[in-house]
Every structure is written in structure tokens, then in C-alpha cells.
């Protein structure tokens, strides 16, 4: 058998007066009882109606009844003020049954043809109610053939009576320190047959305060206390209520951090309910007094549990807890009414004693030993031998606690040694040279380490020399014995320096010519600059104008003299620069391989010979006087030359330093 609803058999038909369409007889009484299935009603209308008209249809009539109720008593052909004829009206049973009674009296003044009616069963729309009648369903009504059902809006559930919608209003938990709660639908009437539970649950230490606001309207009874609908408030200490009626209950200070509110309604009534505004309080913490030179934020009348404040110091003051600095400070009020942290101090920023400046000094400008906010100090370098690098030396103690220069630098200024100072103003000779006097060549460095070589001091912790002079020690820098500040090669009175690292030009190939014959030695400590120890300057871009052919340079060293021995005293010689092509040609013939003289070299010496550098001078500086700055600079490095020093037609060959300025600057800045 097919599944699905079993539809009722159709109910429909025709009714007519006896003898219709002929006239009806006197003294007739005929009754029809029509029945429709449950959930259905009967519809009836007349296609013909012709009965004797009488006052209130006392004589002949058709009576329609449904249950105990008379729906209509009909007679005549057309309705009058006191009698009704059906006309085009349709009649409906109130339930599923309809009784039709036809009666004629003992006489008719003229013949009447009676009536013809048709009926049918139709579904009752239970969802349609007459004005003033209670709705079938609380919320939504759904009609269907033979019946109906109710459903509820979200937040409600259908009561077991299948018509009422009870509110789903339990289990709400309020955890904020203040808020509002109300009966469902407030301020519209609250739902029937509902039981609502609301919880306010705050952190321990808080106390909930309840205020009833706006209006209060809960169904009541004149004699019995809230028998229908009621509101109750429960804490861990006591119960308040029940409440009903139209009077706003008083404020309730629960002295509890947890509150349960219960609201119960019955099946009847039409009341707007209630609204509660709740707040909370707690034991206040002591009022925070800002420390001197600080302020509290936010400012409140009182601070209770979970409230917090921060301390902000004025510019130039810092948060300190004892000696320990804080970037920020926030205290939180605890449930016992105490702050979780003690108040810090706002102490004036103290930059502390300024760091010592190597080769310089510091002077307190604001006052002796004053190192606090806005204090001023002045750094300066030791005169004559040091100069301050791009800095005016003035530093101010700023709010961040650092000594800061006018350019915003927090690092110390740098005292750079003054370069190129010499006691000497005129020339002499080495190979065919003469003795140097104190302060003539204060950049001169004696390098011992297997062989005797020379170098020139750069800044206060670098030595410029020839690659071939230190090649063997490139992996053992500590083997180099570096001496300076002396004229006598064998004197015990000198300033000792040690090497930290040796940097040989990557383009230098040992035993394959002398191209790129340049090296730097980094000293493991800075040397103290004085009149006997002063660095040589590196050439400026404009230096080539002082190094043209025939310009005089000066070479110095302890190398071989004309007697064939290493010089005991530092010797020097003034020699002219030789035309590069002339020098190249001089070394084109055997035993020199072609291309011995490169663009990275310069030559100096006399065509007639007699003045030259020699073995033992290697790595030393060929220096020139910059007449604009009146400082000496290194133009060449003693590199190589003829087998016989000072030979006529041959020249001393020097590494051309100006070609290596980027290389030198990179090494020094990187290391």
C-alpha cells in the first residue's frame, strides 16, 4: 500500500425541498445531518430559494445549525429587516457537522417552489481567527488539510500544550562588571509558561548591585503573594523576593559576586515584565599619589578591583624602582584593596660620568660632575697631535639617558692623529743621503722579522708597507717586531708595537714581479702620538699635482748605505720623480723582464745615479710635501730597483699609493 497521509473520502452533495423543483407541500419537516472528517468543515450555498415569507420566519423556514449554535433561519426570497433569505451567501459549519432543517406550516397563500442547496467539506483554516479572539498559536500557526500545528521564533520552545511558546531563557551568564538584563521581549509582554534563569558571575572581590529600572509589571494577585508570575533573586548569602506587581523593587546590594535571577510565568496574562541594570563595586585601593615629577593616568574618583593606573614621568625624568629602570609602570588594584606593585620614583635622568675619550679629555660645562638631564659636557682632543673627527665635541645629557652630540650621535667623538707633521723642511740623501734628526720622519717604522724592512704609520694603529717585505709573515702576524719613535736602528729606546693582522694586496704575486706591492699591518693596540711618532697622510685626490716629473720626494730608512752596510741611524734622501716612460724603458732591457714597470708604480732618482733607496729600506714611504695643507703625504712605497743601488741610468721603483686609496680605506674601515 502506498505510504503517505490517508485522505478522507470526499464529502459533497445536493439538498432540496421535497418535490423540488415543484412546489413543496404543507406540514413538511425534513432534517439533514451532514458530517465532515475531523479538521474539516462544511460549506453550503443555495442555488434556489423560494419559501413563504413570514415574520421572523415563523411559518416556513430552513434552519442551519452547527452543534448547539443556530447559524441562520431562512425564509422568503429576499432578505428584509427582520427576515433573512440566503441570496448568494455561503454558510459554514462551526465544526465538522451541519444540521439543516426544512419546515413548512399548514398553509401557503400561494405556491412556493422551495430550495436547492449544494454542500461540500473543506479544510478548516484554524490559523485564521476572528478579531478579538485569542490566536490559535503563540507565534507561528501552520494550517494543513485536516489540521494545523504551531511553531516558535528562535529563542523559544513549543510548550507541551502544543500552542504556547515558552522562552529559552536559562543559562545566560553575565561576567562583565556592569550590564543590563530584562524579561524576554521587554518592554513587550513577556512569554507565558516560561522559566528563566540568569546568572551574574563576577570575579571574587566584586559585589553586585541590582537596580530595577524603567518599569516593572509582573502578574500579581490581590491577596496571595505572587501566585502566577514571579521574579526571585538568589545570592550565596540570601534570597530576595518573590517580586510581582507594578511597583519597582528597591535597589539590592547583594554583597556577593554571584547572583542568580529566576523568573517564572504561567499560561495567562499580558504584562510587560522588568528590566535590571546591574553594577558592581569592590573594596577600593588607596588613592595613588603621583611621585614628584610624575603623573597618574587615568585619574579616577576611586580605584577598585581590576582598576589600574600608570605613572608617566615628565620629560627628563625616568621611572626607577630603586636603582633599577622601568620603561613603563602600571599597577592593578587587587581584591584585598591593595595595589599589586609599589609606587616607583620619577628620578631625573642621569647619563652618568661620560666615557673617557682616547687621546682626548672631557670638561663639565654645566657644573663640576653634573651629569643629569640637560647637562652639557665638552670633549676635546690633545692639541697638536690629535684633531676631532667631524664633531664639535659638545654633548648634552638627553631624556633617554645618553650623552648626545648636536648631530644626534650617541657614540664618542674620535680623536684622529694629526698626520704629516715633520720637524724637517729641507731635503738630504739616503744612498748618498744624510742622517735624519728627531721629528724629521715621525711616521718611520722599523719592521724586524727575518729581514729588516720599513713602513709608515697610518692613523695610530696601522702601518703601510710593501707586500714583499712582510709576505713571509702574512700568516704569522705576531712574528713581526714593529718599532717606532727612534732614529737609531739598534737603540733600546723605542716604542714597541705588535701586529694583529697582515693584509697583503690580493693582486700581489710573490716572486712574479712587484705589481701591487702594498700591504697593511693592523697593530693590536693604538700607539700614543707625539713629536717622534706621528702618522703620514694619505694622498688627497689633488696630490698628483705635487708628484709630477721632477717633483722632489723624500725617502727614508735604515737600508744599505754606500758602504754596503745597514745604516745605524735613520737616513733620508731627496730624489726627483722620473718620467714614467723613461723609467719603463730603463727596465726593458735584460736582465729585467718586459713590463716590469707598471702603471701602479712610480720611479724616482737621478739619471746620474748616486741617490737611491736600497735593500732594508723596503716598505718605507716616499713622501711629498703638500704645499696647500703644509702636510707630508705618502706618494710611494719603496718596492724594487736595480741590483746595484744608485746605479746611473736606473731608478728606484715605488708602489704608486694614490692608486690604492680605495683598497686602503676599505681594509681600514672593515677591520
Amino acid at each position: 500500500t502506498p505510504l503517505g497521509p490517508k485522505w478522507p473520502e470526499p464529502v459533497f452533495g445536493r439538498l432540496a425541498s421535497p418535490g423540488f423543483p415543484g412546489e413543496y407541500a404543507n406540514d413538511q419537516e425534513r432534517r439533514w445531518t451532514l458530517t465532515a472528517p475531523p479538521g474539516y468543515r462544511l460549506r453550503l450555498y443555495f442555488t434556489h430559494f423560494d419559501l413563504e415569507l413570514s415574520h421572523l420566519c415563523e411559518y416556513d423556514f430552513v434552519k442551519l445549525s452547527s452543534g448547539a449554535k443556530v447559524l441562520a433561519t431562512l425564509c422568503g426570497q429576499e432578505s428584509t429587516d427582520t427576515e433573512r433569505a440566503p441570496g448568494k451567501d455561503t454558510f459554514y459549519s462551526l465544526g465538522s457537522s451541519l444540521d439543516i432543517t426544512f419546515r413548512s406550516d399548514y398553509s401557503n397563500e400561494k405556491p412556493f417552489t422551495g430550495f436547492e442547496a449544494f454542500y461540500a467539506a473543506e479544510d478548516i483554516d484554524e490559523c485564521q481567527v476572528a478579531p478579538g479572539e485569542a490566536p490559535t498559536c503563540d507565534h507561528h500557526c501552520h494550517n494543513h488539510l485536516g489540521g494545523f500545528y504551531c511553531s516558535c521564533r528562535a529563542g523559544y520552545v513549543l510548550h507541551r500544550n502544543k500552542r504556547t511558546c515558552s522562552a529559552l531563557c536559562s543559562g545566560q551568564v553575565f561576567t562583565q562588571r556592569s550590564g543590563e538584563l530584562s524579561s524576554p521581549e521587554y518592554p513587550r509582554p513577556y512569554p507565558k509558561l516560561s522559566s528563566c534563569t540568569y546568572s551574574i558571575s563576577l570575579e571574587e572581590g566584586f559585589s553586585v548591585i541590582l537596580d530595577f529600572v524603567e518599569s516593572f509589571d509582573v502578574e500579581t494577585h490581590p491577596e496571595t503573594l505572587c501566585p502566577y508570575d514571579f521574579l526571585k533573586i538568589q545570592t550565596d548569602r540570601e534570597e530576595h523576593g518573590p517580586f510581582c506587581g507594578k511597583t519597582l523593587p528597591h535597589r539590592i546590594e547583594t554583597k556577593s559576586n554571584t547572583v542568580t535571577i529566576t523568573f517564572v510565568t504561567d499560561e495567562s496574562g499580558d504584562h510587560t515584565g522588568w528590566k535590571i541594570h546591574y553594577t558592581s563595586t569592590a573594596q577600593p585601593c588607596p588613592y595613588p599619589m603621583a611621585p614628584p615629577n610624575g603623573h597618574v593616568s587615568p585619574v579616577q574618583a576611586k580605584y577598585i578591583l581590576k582598576d589600574s593606573f600608570s605613572i608617566f614621568c615628565e620629560t627628563g625624568y625616568e621611572l626607577l624602582q630603586g636603582h633599577l629602570p622601568l620603561k613603563s609602570f602600571t599597577a592593578v588594584c587587587q581584591k584585598d584593596g591593595s595595589w599589586d606593585r609599589p609606587m616607583p620614583a620619577c628620578s631625573i635622568v642621569d647619563c652618568g660620568p661620560p666615557d673617557d675619550l682616547p687621546s682626548g679629555r672631557v670638561e663639565y660645562i654645566t657644573g663640576p660632575g653634573v651629569t643629569t638631564y640637560k647637562a652639557v659636557i665638552q670633549y676635546s682632543c690633545e692639541e697638536t697631535f690629535y684633531t676631532m673627527k667631524v664633531n664639535d665635541g659638545k654633548y648634552v645629557c638627553e631624556a633617554d639617558g645618553f650623552w648626545t652630540s648636536s648631530k644626534g650621535e650617541k657614540s664618542l667623538p674620535v680623536c684622529e692623529p694629526v698626520c704629516g707633521l715633520s720637524a724637517r723642511t729641507t731635503g738630504g740623501q739616503i744612498y748618498g743621503g744624510q742622517k735624519a734628526k728627531p721629528g724629521d720622519f715621525p711616521w718611520q717604522v722599523l719592521i724586524l722579522g727575518g729581514t729588516t724592512a720599513a713602513g709608515a704609520l697610518l692613523y695610530d694603529n696601522w702601518v703601510l708597507t710593501a707586500a714583499h717585505a712582510v709576505y713571509e709573515q702574512k700568516h704569522d702576524a705576531s712574528a713581526l717586531d714593529i718599532r717606532m719613535g727612534t732614529l737609531k736602528r739598534l737603540s733600546p729606546h723605542y716604542t714597541q708595537a705588535w701586529s694583529e693582522a697582515v693584509f697583503i694586496h690580493e693582486g700581489y704575486t710573490h716572486d712574479a714581479g712587484f705589481d701591487n706591492d702594498i700591504a697593511l699591518i693592523k697593530l693590536n693596540n693604538k700607539v700614543v702620538i707625539n713629536s717622534n711618532i706621528t702618522p703620514i697622510c694619505l694622498p688627497r685626490k689633488e696630490a698628483e699635482s705635487f708628484m709630477r716629473t721632477d717633483d722632489i720626494g723624500t725617502a727614508s730608512g735604515w737600508g744599505l748605505t754606500q758602504r754596503g752596510f745597514l745604516a745605524r741611524n735613520l737616513m733620508y734622501v731627496d730624489i726627483p720623480i722620473v718620467d714614467h716612460q723613461k723609467c719603463t724603458a730603463a727596465y726593458e732591457k735584460p736582465p729585467y723582464p718586459r713590463g716590469s714597470v707598471t702603471a701602479n708604480m712610480l720611479c724616482a732618482g737621478l739619471e746620474s745615479g748616486g741617490k737611491d733607496s736600497c735593500r732594508g729600506d723596503s716598505g718605507g714611504a716616499l713622501v711629498f710635501l703638500d704645499s696647500e695643507t703644509e702636510r707630508w703625504f705618502v706618494g710611494g712605497i719603496v718596492s724594487w730597483g736595480s741590483m746595484n743601488c744608485g746605479e746611473a741610468g736606473q731608478y728606484g721603483v715605488y708602489t704608486k699609493v694614490i692608486n690604492y686609496i680605495p683598497w686602503i680605506e676599505n681594509i681600514i674601515s672593515d677591520f
Epitope: L324, P325, L326, P342, D400, F402
Partner: antibody
Framework: QVQLQESGPGLVKPSETLSLTCTVS?????????WNWIRQPPGKKLEWMGY???????SYNPSLKSRITISRDTSKNQFSLKLSSVTAADTAVYYC???????WGQGTLVTVSS | DIVMTQSPATLSVSPGERATLSCKAS??????VAWYQQKPGQSPRALIY???YRYSGIPARFSGSGSGTEFTLTISSLQSEDFAVYFC?????????FGGGTKVEIK
């Protein structure tokens, strides 16, 4: 969870420089507080050596001022201790800690011996 | 330097009893004092800061009091895990200094 971890050589020769690093996790050293180095020679009491603050400022124990440097590497969230010219008296367990000691490293023993 | 003097050097207490440890500063340090517990081979553990503020996670049996030059750490009812060395520490002035410690041992 804030954690501090000291690292560095356990043996240093006299006259050399002792170098230790404290790596901080769970909190940025630039966010707040002072970051301390504290040491404890065997059987002796704790000695505060110095701190570097959230801003990079330093404060040193005057007894060590000529030998101590505290620096930081904010990219690695580390701060470091350098103590120069060490002697046997510098043998101790070295701790790094935050502010007034709410968090400490586990400590590292440094022995100064040739 | 501010000297922090702890007394007694050793305190013998039975479990469940109260222990009172004293720390005296040679100068006024306000309330800038912390207390630490140290067990052998371990780093110190912070108990109290600012003389009387207990760190979170520290049992309520530990309490600190005092200000100025006299400070006290009280352990209301000693548990077996409380037997250790306790240090006080002032952070009021440079250099920060520590007390010599009080060893709390089982009686």
C-alpha cells in the same frame, strides 16, 4: 614563559677576557626592565656585576667598572658580558637575571686557570 | 656600598613551624628589597620584591615585611621543600648588594 640561558666558555686563562652571552626567550629585552649579570664565587654570596637596561643604558658595579662591558644584540634578543684581565678570583657561577630577579638563567660555571 | 647583613646564618626549624629570617641594611633602602630562595646547584628563585610583595605562584606561607633598614622574611609553616638558603637583596643603590644568606635546615 620568560626564559634566560647563559652560554660561553667554562675555562678562561688568567689575564684574558671572559665572554658570556645570555639569550632571552619569551620577552623582548627592549620591552622593559634591567637585564643583570650576577655571579657567585664557590661558597660565597651573590655579587651584582651590572645591568643593561631596556634602552641600552648600562650600570656597572664600581668594583668592576674598569674591566666590565655589558652589551646587547637586539636582533637576537641577547645581552653579553665581557670581563677583561681575569684572575682566579673571577672564578664563579655566572647568572643572568631580569630586573630584581623574577627570572634567572640556570647559571654557568667559569673557571679562571692556566 | 650598602651592606646587607642576614641573621641568623643558620636556622634550625621543624617542619610545620614558623621561620623568621632577618636582614639589616647599612643604609636606608626604602622598600627596595627582594628575597630569594636557593637550593644547592640551582639558581636563585624569587620570592618577594619591594619588601612585601609576593611573586605570583609563590605560596602564601611566604611573607615579607619591613622598610628602611630592617627587613623580615617569614615562612609561616615550613614545608619539606622550604629547606634551603635564603638571600636578601637591595636594589636601591649602585652597587646592588646581597646578604650573605640564611640557611634554613631541618631540626
Amino acid at each position: 614563559q620568560v626564559q634566560l640561558q647563559e652560554s660561553g666558555p667554562g675555562l678562561v686563562k688568567p689575564s684574558e677576557t671572559l665572554s658570556l652571552t645570555c639569550t632571552v626567550s619569551g620577552y623582548s629585552i627592549t620591552s622593559d626592565y634591567a637585564w643583570n649579570w650576577i655571579r657567585q664565587p664557590p661558597g660565597k654570596k651573590l655579587e651584582w656585576m651590572g645591568y643593561i637596561s631596556y634602552s641600552g643604558r648600562t650600570s656597572y658595579n664600581p668594583s668592576l667598572k674598569s674591566r666590565i662591558t655589558i652589551s646587547r644584540d637586539t636582533s637576537k634578543n641577547q645581552f653579553s658580558l665581557k670581563l677583561s684581565s681575569v684572575t682566579a678570583a673571577d672564578t664563579a657561577v655566572y647568572y643572568c637575571s631580569r630586573h630584581y630577579g623574577d627570572y634567572w638563567g640556570q647559571g654557568t660555571l667559569v673557571t679562571v686557570s692556566s | 656600598d650598602i651592606v646587607m647583613t642576614q641573621s641568623p646564618a643558620t636556622l634550625s626549624v621543624s617542619p610545620g613551624e614558623r621561620a623568621t629570617l632577618s636582614c639589616k641594611a647599612s643604609q636606608n633602602v626604602g622598600t627596595n628589597v627582594a628575597w630569594y630562595q636557593q637550593k644547592p646547584g640551582q639558581s636563585p628563585r624569587a620570592l618577594i620584591y619591594s619588601a612585601s610583595y609576593r611573586y605570583s605562584g609563590i605560596p602564601a606561607r611566604f611573607s615579607g615585611s619591613g622598610s628602611g633598614t630592617e627587613f623580615t622574611l617569614t615562612i609561616s609553616s615550613l614545608q619539606s621543600e622550604d629547606f634551603a638558603v635564603y638571600f636578601c637583596h637591595q636594589y636601591n643603590a649602585n652597587p646592588l648588594t646581597f646578604g650573605g644568606g640564611t640557611k634554613v635546615e631541618i631540626k
